[in-house]
């Protein structure tokens, strides 16, 4: 249990979603930059 009350399951899921969101934003930014440079 993450804090004695809750499992760490949901916070793990949310952390994974946050990482995916961040990577999507970074990759999206890079793609836009590449298109702009062309």
């Amino acid at each position: 249990h993450s804090d004695g009350i809750f499992t760490d399951s949901y916070s793990r899921y949310r952390k994974q979603m946050a990482v995916k969101k961040y990577l999507a934003a970074v990759l999206g930014k890079r793609y836009k930059q590449r298109v702009k440079n062309k």
Epitope: D3, I5, F6, Y10, S11, Q16, K20, K21
Partner: antibody, heavy 117, light 112 residues
Framework: QQLEQSGGGAEGGLVKPGGSLELCCKA??????????MCWVRQAPGKGLNWIGC????????DYATWVDAQFTLSRDIDQNTGCLQLNSLTPADTAMYYC??????WGQGTLVTVSS | AQVLTQTPSSVSAAVGGTVTINCQSS???????LSWFQQKPGQPPKFLIY???KLASGVPSRFSGSGSGTQFTLTISGVQCSDAATYYC?????????????FGGGTEVVVK
């Protein structure tokens, strides 16, 4: 440890169509932390559970079910150990029991909202 | 939008019998993040199972979950009168592509 819900119910859960209402949920016996997400679920009379949205106690980031369509807004005050759900432009179809939950593991007792003229 | 289809919508079982409830997801849930809940009339849902097969704290071992991807099952072995309730599955999805969560329609368990 429990979640205490307020707003609506005995405190005036009868709202006229087009009206607004704020439901709040206070964590009791534990402190909200960055590992907690406060989610809201509603249940129309005699029907199933319907996810509304979730807000991070830490960052305040929120996500909503597509059907919500900006009608509802989530907020949180980590210092007050509280999260709230603002309901706007209510219609009779929004009549339901509204539950708050932390990480879908600990649930509030629910607040009945009735929308009727 | 994702859909979680629960079958059957209602099931009757004798005390000591076995109940199986199915939950089919479209699309796949994210990395087996599928939970089960029990709800009795006038009460909030109770957290039973998470990540498809892990038992929540304090839940009797007669409850078990299995499955992955799109197909999940909740089994109650040695059904007791206190198990009469409605059961719901909840899927967690890749939020970037769709809603983060969806509930199944529920299965009413009647104990004879």
């Amino acid at each position: 440890q429990q979640l205490e819900q307020s707003g609506g119910g005995a405190e005036g859960g009868l709202v006229k169509p087009g009206g607004s209402l704020e439901l709040c949920c206070k964590a009791s016996g534990f402190s909200l932390t960055t590992s907690h997400w406060m989610c809201w679920v509603r249940q129309a009379p005699g029907k199933g559970l319907n996810w509304i949205g979730c807000i991070s106690a830490g960052s305040g980031d929120a996500d909503y079910a597509t059907w919500v369509d900006a009608q509802f807004t989530l907020s949180r005050d980590i210092d007050q150990n509280t999260g709230c759900l603002q309901l706007n432009s209510l219609t009779p179809a929004d009549t339901a029991m509204y539950y708050c939950t932390i990480n879908f593991e600990l649930w509030g007792q629910g607040t009945l909202v009735t929308v009727s003229s | 939008a994702q859909v979680l289809t629960q079958t059957p919508s209602s099931v009757s079982a004798a005390v000591g019998g076995t109940v199986t409830i199915n939950c089919q997801s479209s699309p796949s849930v994210y990395s087996s993040y599928l939970s089960w809940f029990q709800q009795k009339p006038g009460q909030p849902p109770k957290f039973l199972i998470y990540e498809a097969s892990k038992l929540a704290s304090g839940v009797p071992s007669r409850f078990s979950g299995s499955g992955s991807g799109t197909q999940f099952t909740l089994t109650i072995s040695g059904v007791q009168c206190s198990d009469a309730a409605t059961y719901y599955c909840l899927g967690a999805y890749d939020c970037g592509r769709t809603d983060c969560h969806a509930f199944g329609g529920g299965t009413e368990v009647v104990v004879k």
